[in-house]
C-alpha cells in the first residue's frame, strides 16, 4: 500500500522559518504534488506550492523555495513574517497524485516539545485516499 510521509522542521537560525519535507512510498509515477497548510488541500487548507515533474513549480507566499529532492520526495522552505507567518502548531499537508495508485495525502506538524533546529520524525499517518 502506498504511503506519504511528512516531516516538519523549524530552523534554529530563523525561528519563523520552516522546512517541510514530504515523500511518496509507492511504485507509481508521480504526476503532481500539492503542499498546503491549515489542513488538507480542498478541506480548508491553503495551497503553498504545486510541483509538476514535467511543467515546473508554482509557489505562493510565505513559501520561499519549493523543489524536488528526488523523483518521489520534495521539500519546501517557508519564510514567515507578519500575518502569514507559520506557527509551531501549524499543520502542513502533502498530496501526491500518482499513476496508477491515485491521490494520497498525509499531514504533519512540529511536535510541541521540539526545540528549534530539531525536526519531527517522518510521519506516514494519517493517510487519506482521495481518488
Amino acid at each position: 500500500t502506498p504511503e506519504v510521509w511528512v516531516q516538519v522542521r523549524m530552523e534554529a537560525t530563523e525561528l519563523s522559518s520552516f522546512t517541510i519535507r514530504c515523500g511518496f512510498l509507492g511504485s507509481g509515477s508521480i504526476s503532481l504534488v500539492t503542499v498546503s497548510w491549515g489542513g488538507p488541500n480542498g478541506a480548508g487548507g491553503t495551497t503553498l506550492a504545486v510541483l509538476h515533474p514535467e511543467r515546473g513549480i508554482r509557489q505562493w507566499a510565505p513559501a520561499r523555495q519549493a523543489r524536488w529532492e528526488t523523483q518521489s520526495s520534495i521539500s519546501l522552505i517557508l519564510e514567515g513574517s507578519g500575518a502569514s507567518s507559520p506557527c509551531a502548531n501549524t499543520t502542513f499537508c502533502c498530496k501526491f497524485a500518482s499513476f496508477p495508485e491515485g491521490s494520497w495525502e498525509a499531514c504533519g506538524s512540529l511536535p510541541p516539545s521540539s526545540d528549534p533546529g530539531l525536526s519531527a520524525p517522518p510521519t506516514p499517518a494519517p493517510i487519506l485516499r482521495a481518488d
Partner: nanobody
Amino acid sequence: EVQLVESGGGLVQPGGSLRLSCAASETYFDLYVMGWYRQAPGKDRELVATITYTGSIKYVDSVKGRFTISRGDAKNSVYLQMNSLRAEDTAVYYCNADPSGLGRKVYWGQGTMVTVSS
C-alpha cells in the same frame, strides 16, 4: 509541452558582445532550471551556463568572467550576455529547461547560431 524560443544570435567580431534571449511557453509554473548549451561544428553539445528559479548559477570554466546568465522579469525567460567573444565561442547555442531539476523531462530550443569571426 513546453516550447522554448531563442533569439539574439548572429555574426560578431572577436572581442565583441551578444545577448541571447530565450522565452518559454510555460507561464503558470516556474521552470526549476533554465540554461544554455552550445554545440560547435564537429563537437559534442556542452553546458555553457544554468540558473535555477531560486538564482543558483553554474558556468563552464571557459566562459567564467565573460558570460553572464540571468532570468528575466518575464516568467520563464533566460538571457545570456556574452562579452569578450572569441573564435572558439562559435557554435549553435541552445536554450534548455528542466522543469523539475531532476532531468525527468528536459526541453530544448531550436538553437541560434553565434559566429565569432573577423
